[in-house]
Amino acid sequence: QPSVSPGEPSPPSIHPGKSDLIVRVGDEIRLLCTDPGFVKWTFEILDETNENKQNEWITEKAEATNTGKYTCTNKHGLSNSIYVFVRDPAKLFLVDRSLYGKEDNDTLVRCPLTDPEVTNYSLKGCQGKPLPKDLRFIPDPKAGIMIKSVKRAYHRLCLHCSVDQEGKSVLSEKFILKVRPAFKAVPVVSVSKASYLLREGEEFTVTCTIKDVSSSVYSTWKRENSQTKLQEKYNSWHHGDFNYERQATLTISSARVNDSGVFMCYANNTFGSANVTTTLEVVDKGFINIFPMINTTVFVNDGENVDLIVEYEAFPKPEHQQWIYMNRTFTDKWEDYPKSENESNIRYVSELHLTRLKGTEGGTYTFLVSNSDVNAAIAFNVYVNTKPEILTYDRLVNGMLQCVAAGFPEPTIDWYFCPGTEQRCSASVLPVDVQTLNSSGPPFGKLVVQSSIDSSAFKHNGTVECKAYNDVGKTSAYFNFAFKGNNKEQIHPHTLFTP
């Protein structure tokens, strides 16, 4: 029994005065607590606790389940204990079958003995299977058997506590060890979409998936630079051992422009943290922005092909697209497709394929697109470059030689005189009059130029060349002159094609 110096409060004394007491099943347990300030007896075994306010604890017919620690406490909070074993050959173990071990920690298999004098108190595998080679344990008859440094590999290990009684091995009920994993990596987090674009009033919902070894992982949605509590819901699954998945869904039922911003899904465990973000942009109404991929003024040579290409952003998604020329809608020759197959794509491409363009096909080509909120359009001015064509070449009544040529860009007309029968004319002749005429065709059609020279300047037989040219090519027409006495005659004018 403990002894203390006089004057100080002392712990209660217990009779019988020993730390351990062994009684047989069916016998009486009689414990007396002596203390002037007696408060209570407490009995503890496994997770069970009982109290008794009498200073004498009497159990008339002891059972194995009366095995445990009996503690007497006084008003000063001082206590004294005795451990009672109720020996029952038919019930050698008291058991609490719940067995949860934290990875890398020790865990107790709770199978205290009712008889401390049995031997070889240890653990055995179920159905004669051996225990893992690295499993170490320490037996304690009053508490159970402590497994040291639990490994993840022990998860769902089937065990028995075992003793030898009269030369025979006796097993307890079976225990299944459940290992709660230690976190040895940060959680794995992912988000359903990296960015969202919504109109005011639409619902914003984004899901974060958190994967870890157990449900103890912490996760939350946060708004960057804000402390506001967000409304989120979650769901979770156990996909077998050490494979836990949680889906945390953040919802804003009616998004506003000022809800725009960056939202972070944050997860952490005892090892560390991880996060992933998503961006929300809320617009007051939809939009369409068109970006021409080529210059909106296009020059193309006669007979060649050209592709008119636009990219455009449309939100919500485009509903109607069309290409128009001269108030006519193209039914074919164009294609429209999303820039990417990404679910959040808002960028599209439209291409109009113009093939073997004729000089008469210049003009304004318009792309129109609309969605439920807005319409937008872009125009391309297409100019078809054509080699000059000499429309008329005449000697006028007033003696002027006149040449009229059409082409695009605007042709230049030069005049040359060749003496005699030479076809190579080099001496240039200055025109008397040059005019650009208004074309009766479309505004993007050929430009018509008229040039005149005075034929009275020519005193000898020869050929006059009218040469019309531009960036695309050149064409010539010829006037042949022959003098008969003092009379000048124009002989058949003719043209010569020059590629």
Epitope: S98, Y100, R180, S215, S216, E232, H238
Partner: antibody, heavy 123, light 107 residues
Framework: QVQLVQSGAEVKKPGASVKVSCKAS????????ISWVRQAPGQGLEWMGV????????NYAQKFQGRVTMTRDTSTSTVYMELSSLRSEDTAVYYC????????????????WGQGTLVTVSS | DIQMTQSPSSLSASVGDRVTITCQAS??????LNWYQQKPGKAPKLLIY???NLETGVPSRFSGSGSGTDFTLTISSLQPEDFATYYC?????????FGGGTKLEIK
């Protein structure tokens, strides 16, 4: 010994809302998940949802989505369950229960239950 | 959602009888299965958790077994205070679901 103490019985009209509280006495439950389970007269148990300290939100059974909100006030060790747009079939005893046993610490068995709150919906 | 089917829905037995109640899950729930006892006008009480673990203070005549989809609650020797309704509940994934209950009555 932790106990869950719920607010008293309520009588509500259809279309109204009810807010039931569940307070931990004799301890705290800031580190425990709390579920709400209801039982209509003569019927079985029906899980409504859970509020979990390891998640920034709650999990609600599909049947109650949009009508139920569960919140927690750690300073007073109280959780709340609000059910809106009440109808006669919501007449039931509503229990809060602590997830306190089992391998999954936050999703384990209900080891402590409140005494229940009878909510009667009647016009 | 995981459906929990309990059988029988009601059962008459006498004191001292051995009684077995079964619970079947619509998909594998490992051993995340709990059993509760409920008496009229009272809150449910946890008996067994994780299929086979006896809750503290619950008499050892109650035992649970099973894994995967099939589970059993056994009362080895019925006592008068055991006449009540028993529910199983899965904790493998949300939404958590209960069986329909088994009402145990005195024969």
């Amino acid at each position: 010994q932790v106990q869950l103490v719920q607010s008293g019985a309520e009588v509500k009209k259809p279309g109204a809302s009810v807010k039931v509280s569940c307070k931990a006495s004799g301890g705290t439950f800031s580190s425990y998940a709390i579920s709400w389970v209801r039982q209509a007269p003569g019927q079985g148990l029906e899980w409504m949802g859970v509020i979990n300290p390891t998640v920034g939100g709650a999990n609600y059974a599909q049947k109650f989505q949009g009508r139920v909100t569960m919140t927690r006030d750690t300073s007073t060790s109280t959780v709340y369950m609000e059910l809106s747009s009440l109808r006669s079939e919501d007449t039931a005893v509503y229990y809060c229960a602590r997830h306190g046993r089992g391998y999954n610490e936050y999703e384990g068995a209900f080891d402590i239950w409140g005494q229940g709150t009878l909510v009667t919906v009647s016009s | 959602d995981i459906q929990m089917t309990q059988s029988p829905s009601s059962l008459s037995a006498s004191v001292g009888d051995r009684v077995t109640i079964t619970c079947q899950a619509s998909q594998d729930i490992s051993d995340y299965l709990n059993w509760y006892q409920q008496k009229p006008g009272k809150a449910p009480k946890l008996l067994i958790y994780d299929a086979s673990n006896l809750e503290t203070g619950v008499p050892s005549r109650f035992s649970g077994s099973g894994s995967g989809t099939d589970f059993t609650l056994t009362i080895s020797s019925l006592q008068p205070e055991d006449f009540a309704t028993y529910y199983c509940q899965q904790g493998n994934s949300f939404p958590l679901t209960f069986g329909g209950g088994t009402k145990l009555e005195i024969k």
